[in-house]
Structures are given as C-alpha cells and as structure tokens.
C-alpha cells in the first residue's frame, strides 16, 4: 500500500535505533571521508525529521522519497565539492539520475588506515562511557570501508559486538574473553561483506536473471522440501531486497528484510523444518539466522531427473512454452538434489542444459538429440572435482604458507601485468581457502571452495575495473560471472608478457624484516616470489624450488646471526647473482 | 503466451490432396523444430512429420513417407503440411506442436477420407 510519508512509514517498521543505525550506515557508505562527528550530526536532523513527519505526514517534504531527501542532505553539505571532488557533480542531475550517479562513486578501496582494534581496557573504556556513540562509530568505520556491506546485517554484527563488550567488560581478563569473541566477528563480518558484494555485482553487472538463478540455486539447497513456486516467491522477494540494498536503499531494504523474514516463519511448514529455531528470535537475529540457516534433508524418493528433463516428449513444448521457469525448475531440481555442488557449478550445469535444448529443440528429432544431455555435461561436474582434489594434495603437502606461494606463481604466470602487492593479496586470499575447506569431509569440500574462490576473485575484478592493467583479467571477469573461476583456472603464461628487467632492489633485505612479525615477513618474502616471476615468468618449477631454498637459508642466516645487517649487506648480494645465475 | 492454430483440414475423397497450416505465435518460431501429430477418434496420438528449425532436416512416419510433406516457411512463422494419395486410414484430427511433442496446444484441424 501507498503511504503519504516513506519515511514516516520505514521510521515507524524499524523504530528509532535500527532507523538511526541505517541512516549513518547510508551516509557512512556514500561519503566515505568524512568524519563521525559530521555524520552524527546529519543522523539526528534525519531522525528529528522523521519523527515531524510520523507527527504529520503531510507536513512539508514528508512525501517526498527517502532517495531524494537524502540526495538533499548530501547535496546541502558545504565542503562537498572540497572533500569529494566531482561527486558534487552529481548534485546537478535530476534524481534518478543524481542516485545512479552517487552510487557510481562509492569506492571499493577507500585510501583509509586499517580499522584497528585498540587495547582490551581503551576498548572498554569508550564503550562505557557512551556505548551509543560507541557503537556507532563502529558502524561509521565498517560502512566507509565496506560501501556495499549488507546494512541490515552490520546492524547485526553491532549488536554482536555490543553483546562481546558487555560481557567482556567486566570480565577479569578483558583480553582473554574478548580477543576470540571479536576475531571470530570480525572473520564471519568480512565474508557477509564479499557475499553481498558478490551479490550487488551479479545484480548491477549481469542483470537481475543472473541473480534470480544464483538464488535459486541456493535457496533449493537450502530448503530441499520447498516446492518450485515456493522458493521462486521467496527468490522475487529476495531480489527486492538486494536490489535495494545494493541501490543504497537501506531503509526500505531493511524493512523489506524484516517482511521477507516474517513471511518465511509464517509459511515454515512449507519452506524448511530448520526455520523453527530462527523463528522464534528477535529480529535481526531471526533473519540473521534463515541467513546462515542449516540446510534441510532431502526428501526421499526423488524421481530421477532424466524423467522430466530428458525422457520426457515435452521438453522443447515446455521450453518454448516458458523458457525461464521451464530452466528454473530445472536449476531448482538439480540444486536441491546436489548440496554438495557449488552455486557456480550449478548454474554452468543449468547453462550448459540450456545451451543443448537451445541446439536440440531446433532440430527435427530433438530428443535423439538431447537424450545423452547428462553425460555430456559430465566435464562441468569432473573439472572443478578434479581441481580441488589436486590443489587440496598440494596444500595437504606444502601448508598454507607454501601453497600461497604456489600460488603465487601460478597468478603471476596468469596475469603479469597485476602489481605485486595485488598478486600478494590474492595469493594469500586464495591460499586462505585451502585452510578454511580442504580439512572439511569430501562433501563439503568443493561447494565451500568453489564459493569463497567465486567471492575473492569477484574482489578482484571489482579492484581490477577500477584501474585495468591486464586483458586476460577483464576478459574473465566481464564475460560470464558463472565461468569467472574457470576463466582463471585456463589461463596459463602469458605469452605476450615482457618480461621485467633485473631491479636488484626488488630483491634487497635489511635487518628489519627479522624483527617483524610473522604475517608480514611472509608478505615481504612473497613479494620478492612475484617481482623474481615476473623477471623470469618461465622460470621451471625447480628453479624456483632452489631460488626459494637459497633465499630462506639466506634470510635464516642473517637473522640468527650477531651482526644481522652486515650480513645482509654481504650476502645479499651473493644471493641475487647465485638467483640469477639459477634462473638464467 | 504460446499460440499454434491449425487450418485447411475438410472432406477429402480417397487419393486426394490437402495442405494443412499451423499458424504459430508467442515464441520464437526458427529456434524451435516443428511436428504434425495426428489422432484417429478412439485412438492415441500419432506422430506424423517433423522438420527442424530452418527447414532443413525433415523425418517422416513410415505410414505417410512418399505421400506427404512438412514445410514452414519462417517469414510467416507458418508450418504446413501437403498431404497427397489420401487414404481413408489418414482420417483423423491434425495438430501441430513444438519439438517432439505429442501433446496437443491448438484446437486442430479434422481430416476426414472418405468417398
């Protein structure tokens, strides 16, 4: 139903925490550099507006969209043009235009310092004194950073927070009770934050379909008991909104989220029995919950899919009868059916069904021609299978920290033209992988895979837009969003790749790296791997084997020895020769 | 929504000719092989004739090959089907549907060989 006040209407669904939190997440999100303080102060004279018009709907401005009053705001800041350069440009077009135009420059890599954590006491300290403030202000930091982190759900992991501090602060040993509690936080904030960042892109650079089907897919493996017409209700809702909190719509996203929740208890019995425990939570728990939901059990006796998608006469009547729900029923049976396979490997399966019916169904005899459709989508299942059994043998045998610097020089073979703290980066993102799912059992495996690597490579092309450096990589991530991942795994050295000259800085130690910790000499040693491919991209597995060997006996060397830094000076030198002469 | 209409049936004697027209709408009509079914009363549905999307591939029952022929013509999105040398077992209700179909979407046209 219409409501003559938006905002008077999402002020009322939400209450007045949930609403202020959205709105300094919104603000936090599109004006990423300005202070807290700045974004406070809009907060309230937007919630003081809103509780006018829940007053008086009709008061002036109320009907206006939420998207327009807050494009007002934005455009009424005083140091725009100053702190934000040419997106106060935006300010002279007409809304829709001047929304598309603002989301247009939010930026997935903000220049802004790591969040860091403070002490457990100053940590508690602050939260004491003002735990609203407190808490705020860790919205504040994770929006700016995170411009397209799913709002509903930060509200959620604040609530979290707030709860660790509670009971930590008043813990004897603050550390002890606090560092695992926010670690484990701050781990599950960052993947919802690759996810929904997955989902705006699957939205805003393949459309709405490629959405709708990446939540088919994985709404049928939740819920396997559901029927078709259910899990497409729910995916129609769903598409709502994401769409909207994709759009920076995140008062209407957050209480269409809310509905979307409500709906699904309300219909459990017909959705999933693992509803039961999520539906009895407070809010943002409860869809927090049917987020992260356990998936149901299979029901028993399910046909054979050949029956209805290779047997049966009807197949091309139905596909051209109702082509998206004819492959949508089809994505929903084989999905529920395969919890075991990954999002991707679904929809290439599905994609590769359609690709044959659109080849068959225009044929004299179709069903001759589809009939050995399954066997012939065999290699999509095989291929990724496959990979993640050789990649999990190589990090079972080398651990995280060699199978990062595998790697590492496997991507800068791909994509030389990347910079090095970028390859860095990934290496370690997409070694990581190996140590969140090799350990889990074999059905487990490939889906886990297969989605965070679908999550770090979407970060990558996001990254990679931003300042295009290498074809290959935009050939691979504009082409297919499903075939994105297989697009990386073909790609070998890259022939047209000159290499880079001999920079013996690249290669130069001081005693400080002895000094560092763990984590970072790593990045320091992984660094030196990518400039050393890049020289020589050709370079065979063994030479490498023995530059590596010789550079960390080198490094062992100088940090156990009494005058660390005469050593490096007088060794390093050696070394790089010896490394030349290796690879030469 | 998917249309197929079937025209040109009638009362034909034996050894005569008739063509059938199967006019199609609501999909896309080259991306999709085309059949005739038939169905004499009291019996189940026969395939009769299919021809592929551009026209190019035809398969024929072995009760009508020699004596009838499946066309279409994509300009208009138009099947048809020539049916020569009629004999009394060819009466029967004509459909057309898509792919390997036997099911029936338009109303059907009669065909009825009789002298």
């Known amino acids: 139903e219409a409501h003559k006040s938006e905002i008077a209407h999402r002020f009322n669904d939400l209450g007045e925490g949930h609403f202020k939190g959205l709105v300094l997440i919104t603000l936090s999100q599109h004006l990423q550099k300005s202070p807290f303080e700045e974004h406070v102060k809009l907060v309230n004279e937007v919630t003081d507006f809103a509780k006018a018009c829940v007053a008086d709907e009709s008061a002036q401005n109320c009907g206006k969209a939420i998207a327009t009053l807050f494009g007002d705001k934005v455009c009424a800041i005083p140091s725009l043009r100053e702190t934000y350069g040419e997106l106060a440009d935006c300010c002279a077009k007409e809304d829709p235009d001047r929304v598309e135009c603002f989301l247009q420059h939010k930026d997935d890599n903000p220049n802004l310092p790591p969040f860091e954590r403070p002490e457990p006491e100053a940590l508690c300290t602050a939260f004491k004194e003002n735990n609203d403030r407190f808490i705020g202000h860790y919205l504040y930091e994770v929006s700016r950073r995170h411009p397209y982190f799913y709002a509903p759900e930060l509200l959620y992991y604040a609530e979290k927070y707030k709860n660790a501090l509670t009971e930590c602060c008043e813990a004897a040993d603050k550390a002890a009770c606090l560092t695992p509690k926010l670690d484990a936080i701050k781990e599950k904030a960052l993947v919802s934050s690759a996810q929904q960042r997955l989902k705006c892109a699957s939205l805003q650079k393949f459309g709405e379909r490629a959405f709708k089907a990446w939540s088919v897919a994985r709404l049928s493996q939740k819920f396997p008991k559901a029927e078709f017409a259910e899990i497409s209700t729910i995916v129609t809702s769903l598409t709502k909104v994401t769409k909207e909190c994709c759009h920076g719509d995140l008062l209407e996203c957050a209480d269409d989220r809310q509905e979307l929740a409500k709906y699904m208890c309300e219909h459990q019995d017909s959705i999933s029995s693992k509803l039961k425990e999520c539906c009895v939570k407070p809010t943002l728990q409860k869809a927090h919950c049917i987020l992260e939901i356990q998936r149901d059990e299979l029901p028993t006796e399910l046909p054979d899919l050949a029956v209805d998608f290779v047997e049966d006469k009807e197949v091309c009547k139905n596909f051209a009868e109702a082509k998206d729900v004819f492959l949508g029923t089809f994505l929903y049976e084989y999905s529920r059916r395969h919890p075991e396979y990954s999002i991707g490997m679904l929809l290439r399966i599905a994609k590769g069904y359609e690709a044959k019916l659109e080849k068959c169904c225009a044929e004299a005899d179709p069903h001759a021609c589809y009939a050995k459709v399954f066997d012939e989508l065999q290699p999509l299942i095989d291929e990724p299978k496959k990979l993640v059994q050789q990649n999990c043998e190589l990090f079972d045998k080398l651990g995280e920290y060699g199978f990062q610097n595998a790697l590492a020089v496997r991507y800068t073979q791909k994509a030389p033209q990347v910079s090095t703290p970028t390859l860095v980066e990934y290496a370690r993102k997409l070694g990581s992988v190996g140590t969140k799912c090799c350990s889990l059992p074999e059905t487990e495996r490939l889906s886990c895979t297969e989605n965070y690597l679908a999550l770090i490579l979407n970060r990558l092309c996001i990254l990679h837009e931003k300042t295009p450096v290498s074809e290959r990589v935009t050939k691979c991530c504009t082409e297919s969003l499903v075939n994105r991942r297989p697009c990386f795994s073909a790609l070998h050295v890259d022939e047209t790749y000159v290499p880079k000259p001999f920079h013996a800085d690249s290669f130069t130690f001081h005693a400080d790296i002895c000094t560092l910790p763990e984590k970072e000499k790593q990045v320091k040693k992984q660094m030196a791997l990518v400039e050393l491919v890049k020289h020589k991209p050709k370079a065979s597995e063994e030479q490498m084997k023995t530059v590596m060997g010789d550079f960390a006996a080198f490094l062992k060397k100088c940090c156990d020895a009494d005058n660390k830094e005469a050593c490096f000076t007088e060794d390093g030198p050696k070394l790089v020769a010896k490394c030349q002469a290796t690879l030469a | 929504d998917v249309q197929l209409v079937e025209s040109g049936g009638g009362v034909v004697q034996p050894g005569g000719s008739l063509r059938l027209s199967c006019a199609a709408s609501?999909?896309?009509?080259?991306?999709?092989?085309m059949s005739w079914v038939r169905q004499a009363p009291g019996k189940g549905p026969e395939w009769v004739s299919s021809?592929?999307?551009?026209?190019?591939?035809?398969l024929y029952a072995d009760s009508v090959k020699g004596r009838f022929t499946i066309s279409r013509d994509n300009s208009k999105n138009t099947l048809y089907l020539q049916m020569n040398s009629l004999r009394p077992e060819d009466t029967a209700l004509y459909y057309c549907?898509?792919?390997?179909?036997?099911?029936?979407s338009g109303q059907g046209t009669l065909v009825t060989v009789s002298s």
């Open positions: 549907t898509i792919g390997g179909s036997l099911s029936r």
């Open positions: 609501g999909f896309t009509f080259t991306s999709f092989g």
């Open positions: 021809i592929s999307g551009s026209g190019s591939d035809t």
